[in-house]
């Protein structure tokens, strides 16, 4: 978290916001519900308190407006700048102002207002933007689902450097980015795209260049807003320019930015039985069009040619692949090798001698 | 629906740079990914480079760190700026708006000699 420079705050803490104006976008019963919701992410968490007032000067004054609009920083037109505010102090200090030149939303379409007035909210109160592409402090917008909203660890460190924790936190669960270097990091899935890594933990991913060290995290929705938050297995079908993502009992086909039409689709559609409620990683081999699935402690070998399961699978896993352990978190192939991932340990098994060649740290694949 | 023109192809040195644009009719060009193919004689067309809604980007490995792609949504055009020219680089270039099973526009060629 960042903020402001001198560490501007407010000296009180029952502060008050007035709504100036609406967008034509959204009802003002929507407007309104927004803004209570957005002001309630930080007063869950500190000893703040909002009152909405009516009319006359409230500290935090809320409008809509476009292009220039009255403080000389001016909005774009669609896109862009979506929304700005001031850091708490006297007169334009802590307003927050809505561009609408956007559509504003109570939805993922358009701009979601609670989302976008819950990061200006942000502002109004002292802090500055985050680097941790977890926060909502963070400087892109990405909608992050129709669930409960839950404010990032990150923000709640922010804010209460600032005015200190509340009396009680409805809700006390807050999101962590995860450490790349964790020696306990385990992983969700892994595939290559497009010659990159990506490399999947709870809403997030990895995105691992070639003769690259640093690798950059990304919200998984700030790719691909429609997929779920959370990816069980993903693989990538180079000559196709596809990549697969797997969540629960369904699955997408994404070219590049784009999921393909028709889908989701039920992974019962490639031949598994009703029991299998969720994968738990997934390998594609080009020269072969296999793609090796995993689920539980079994692996399943699904024929590109055929469209359908190999006979003789699903099979155990420890038989298919002794010393792997009866699990796989994630799994790809580079070169010749399969790297099995169990928890925090990788294991690489070379396909030509059909067996396991190293044991490495799961974290070594971020370079740790 | 959109239609998809490329311009500013044409023919350069090995180390030369190029500039495309990919202009967009319809007024929903900025709410598709916009996306850079390229297909050279007796092979397949393959990715070149990427650029989401949001504006995060894409390159494939033999391309990145000399083009850049960019978008401007208000005058609904893309852009792919090619520097450090290589003769493998020559191909046709297409503009693609929303993926494989988008919009495409026809092509402009581009001609890299040593």
């Known amino acids: 978290y960042n903020v402001f420079p001198r560490t501007l705050k407010w000296s009180q803490t029952n502060l008050t916001y007035r709504i100036v104006n609406y967008t034509p976008d959204i009802s003002h019963s929507e407007v309104e519900k927004a803004f209570r919701k957005a002001f309630k992410v930080w007063s869950d968490v500190t000893p703040l308190n909002f009152t909405r007032i009516h009319d006359g000067t409230a500290d935090i004054m809320i409008s809509f407006g476009t292009k220039e609009h009255g403080d000389f920083y001016p909005f774009d037109g669609p896109s862009g700048l979506l929304a700005h505010a001031f850091p708490p102090g006297p007169n334009l200090g802590g307003d927050a102002h809505f561009d609408d030149d956007e559509t504003w939303t109570s939805s993922s379409k358009g701009y979601n207002l609670f989302i976008v007035a819950a990061h200006e909210l942000g502002h109004s109160l002292g802090l500055d933007h985050s680097k941790d592409p977890g926060a909502l402090m963070f400087p892109i917008y990405t909608y992050t689902g129709k669930s409960h909203f839950m404010l990032p660890d990150d923000d709640v460190q922010g804010i209460q450097s600032l005015y200190g924790p509340g009396d009680e936190d409805p809700n006390p669960k807050h999101p962590k980015t995860p450490e790349k270097c964790d020696p306990a990091l385990s992983l969700d899935a892994i595939t290559s795209l497009r010659g990159e890594t990506m490399i999947f933990k709870d809403r997030f991913f990895w995105r691992l260049h070639p003769q690259q060290v640093e690798p950059e995290l990304f919200l998984t929705k700030s790719f691909w807003p429609e997929l779920p938050n959370h990816v069980d297995a993903a693989y990538e079908h180079p000559s196709r320019d596809l990549m697969f993502i797997f969540r629960g009992r369904k699955f997408w086909a994404l070219n590049g930015y784009d999921i393909m039409e028709g889908y989701p689709r039920k992974i019962s559609d490639l031949g598994f039985p009703k029991e299998v409620k969720r994968l738990s990683a997934a390998v594609h081999f080009e020269d072969t069009g296999k793609t090796l699935f995993f689920s539980g402690n079994h692996v399943w070998s699904y024929d590109d040619a055929n469209q359908t399961m190999d006979k003789d699978y699903p099979r155990l896993i420890e038989e298919e692949f002794p010393g792997i352990g009866d699990k796989v978190d994630a799994v790809y192939e580079k070169n010749g090798y399969i790297y099995f991932f169990n928890g925090p340990i990788q294991f690489e098994y070379s396909i030509w001698s059909n067996r396991i060649v190293r044991v490495m740290p799961t974290n070594s694949l971020l370079w740790c | 629906e959109v239609q998809l023109v490329e311009s500013g192809g044409g023919s350069v040195q090995a180390g030369g740079s190029l500039r495309l644009s990919c202009a967009a009719s319809g007024s929903t060009f900025s709410r598709y990914s916009m996306n850079w193919y390229r297909q050279a004689p007796g092979k397949q067309r393959e990715f070149v480079a990427g650029?989401?809604?949001?504006?995060?980007?894409n390159y494939a490995v033999s391309v990145r760190g000399r083009f850049t792609i960019s978008r401007d949504n208000a005058e609904g055009t893309g852009y792919l700026q090619m520097n450090s020219l290589k003769p493998e680089d020559t191909a046709v270039y297409y503009c693609n708006a929303g993926g494989l099973q988008g919009y495409w526009g026809l092509g402009t060629q581009v001609t890299v000699s040593s």
């Open positions: 650029i989401s809604v949001g504006r995060i980007t």
